[in-house]
Interface confidence: low
């Protein structure tokens, strides 16, 4: 067992080294380890094959370090890995698209507060078992097409607190099991009419605190299971172009936030849901 760590066998074979001031992944981690806790240290680099010997590893916590680089092959051989927490590593900024390849059993991936500026093509390829993906509080500006395409079992996707400016047509393709999509506190000004086409099981959608002035009801049409919708804190324009959204909101039987109008001036602060159809004039 590495000197700064505690190792024990029950309830699972565990190597625990949190908050020890470690600057590198320690050598001598027992190959039988099922859980490795390395959070709260000063580790800046995860070299290739750092955990290759740990074929039974199911949980790996590397959050709250100072990771700036993770080699593409850092997690090679971890076919049984189920939880990987890399959150709170603000200097990381980018992740090689091959980093998570081969993690076929991964069900929880924490990449929040990692300073990520982009999601490289194929970053999440092959993660068919993934259920929870935490990407909030990064610096993401875009959602590339088909980024999440392989994540057919994903139920929770957290993207709030980024700099995303639009939701393109293919951003969420393949997310047939998604239950919760949090997109609040971004800069979203445009949602493609078909952006949510695959989200037939989505129950919670947060779009509050964005830059939306309009939202095509065609985008909402596929959301057959939606129960909770938050649209507040957006610069909604309540003219005749808002009529389809108004009509849709009248029918929505789930729970929805207020939708306060910004324009026209005479309706500023009024809730779109509570307006009459003939209030929505102009055009």
């Amino acid at each position: 067992c590495p000197g700064a760590c505690v190792c024990y066998n029950e309830p699972k074979v565990t190597t625990s080294c949190p908050q020890q001031g470690l600057q590198a992944v320690p050598v001598g981690i027992p190959a039988a380890s099922q859980r490795i806790f390395l959070h709260g240290n000063r580790i800046s680099h995860v070299p290739a094959a750092s955990f290759r010997a740990c074929r039974n590893l199911t949980i790996l916590w590397l959050h709250s370090n100072v990771l700036a680089r993770i080699d593409a092959a850092a997690f090679t051989g971890l076919a049984l890995l189920e939880q990987l927490d890399l959150s709170d590593n603000a200097q990381l900024r980018s992740v090689d698209p091959a980093t998570f390849h081969g993690l076929g059993r991964l069900h929880t991936l924490h990449l929040d507060r990692c300073g990520l500026q982009e999601l490289g093509p194929g970053l999440f390829r092959g993660l068919a078992a993934l259920q929870y993906l935490y990407l909030q509080d990064n610096a993401l500006q875009a959602l590339p097409d088909d980024t999440f395409r392989d994540l057919g079992n994903l139920t929770h996707l957290f993207l709030h607190g980024n700099r995303i400016s639009s939701v393109p047509e293919r951003a969420f393709r393949g997310l047939h099991s998604l239950d919760r999509l949090l997109l609040h506190q971004n800069r979203v000004a445009h949602v493609h009419p078909h952006a949510f086409r695959d989200l037939g099981r989505l129950m919670t959608l947060y779009l509050f605190a964005n830059n939306l002035s309009a939202l095509p009801t065609e985008a909402l049409a596929p959301l057959r299971a939606l129960q909770y919708l938050r649209l507040n804190d957006n610069p909604w324009v309540c003219d005749c172009r808002a009529r389809p959204l108004w009509a849709w909101l009248q029918k929505f039987r789930g729970s929805s936030s207020e939708v306060p109008c910004s324009l026209p001036q005479r309706l500023a602060g009024r809730d779109l849901k509570r307006l009459a159809a003939n209030d929505l004039q102009g055009c």
Partner: antibody, heavy 122, light 111 residues
Framework: EVQLLESGGGLVQPGGSLRLSCAAS????????MSWVRQAPGKGLEWVSA????????YYADSVKGRFTISRDNSKNTLYLQMNSLRAEDTAVYYC???????????????WGRGTLVTVSS | QSVLTQPPSVSGAPGQGVSISCTGT?????????VQWYQQFPGTAPKLLIY???RRPSGVPERFSGSKSGTSASLAITGLRTEDEADYYC???????????FGGGTKLTVL
């Protein structure tokens, strides 16, 4: 296979009560709003009541408000309609229907049960 | 009395086309609410035929199409077949009633 099966219909006297059930299978019941729709003999369809997927919100036609209560038990995948103070004009086949349209929370009835007949007569 | 108005009956010969109208008001169809159409054979439950004004669920033949304009909608059936003989109902949502509303139904007879 997605299926809805109603039960609980029958003959009841005016002023009496009846409880209809609708057993759902083949889909994630709690993800869908559900409705009851009725059809009087030889007449058209009339929407009666709806309930959100969680059961937290309920809706009624004016003709049954205060007399009928819709509810659901998501652990049993079952929808209910408690009918009190029944009148002759409540005589109809009662269908339960899944609301599978825009947002699953509104009025596109994509799956229907076979219906159960309620007869109110003295 | 139904909120949405449909003709009680329409008829056509096999191979021909027919159209069934559904007239509403500014508080239902005219307010922008979607229109659905259902097909019902005697003694059976209704079946969804058209939703969101014009979309067809999988399995519904292309012979059935929906359209909407202003405060009315229509269901068109081309290439009539004897098995199309049934009752057809339109349905929408009424913002003043805060209720789902149906038309009175139209009986289609294939001559």
């Amino acid at each position: 296979e997605v299926q809805l099966l109603e039960s609980g219909g029958g003959l009841v006297q005016p002023g009496g009560s009846l409880r209809l059930s609708c057993a759902a299978s083949g889909f994630t019941f709690s993800s869908y709003a559900m409705s009851w729709v009725r059809q009087a003999p030889g007449k058209g369809l009339e929407w009666v009541s709806a309930i959100s997927g969680s059961g937290g919100s309920t809706y009624y036609a004016d003709s049954v408000k205060g007399r009928f209560t819709i509810s659901r038990d998501n652990s049993k995948n079952t929808l209910y309609l408690q009918m009190n103070s029944l009148r002759a004009e409540d005589t109809a086949v009662y269908y339960c229907a899944r609301e599978g349209g825009i947002l699953g929370a509104v009025d596109v009835f994509d799956i229907w049960g076979r219906g159960t007949l309620v007869t109110v007569s003295s | 009395q139904s909120v949405l108005t449909q003709p009680p009956s329409v008829s056509g010969a096999p191979g021909q086309g027919v159209s069934i109208s559904c007239t509403g008001t500014t508080s239902d169809i005219g307010a922008g609410y979607t229109v659905q159409w259902y097909q019902q054979f005697p003694g059976t439950a209704p079946k969804l035929l058209i939703y969101d004004d014009y979309r067809r669920p999988s399995g519904v033949p292309e012979r059935f199409s929906g359209s909407k304009s202003g405060t009315s909608a229509s269901l068109a059936i081309t290439g009539l077949r004897t098995e199309d003989e049934a009752d057809y109902y339109c349905q929408s949502y009424d913002n003043s009633l805060k209720n789902v509303v149906f038309g009175g139904g139209t009986k289609l007879t294939v001559l």
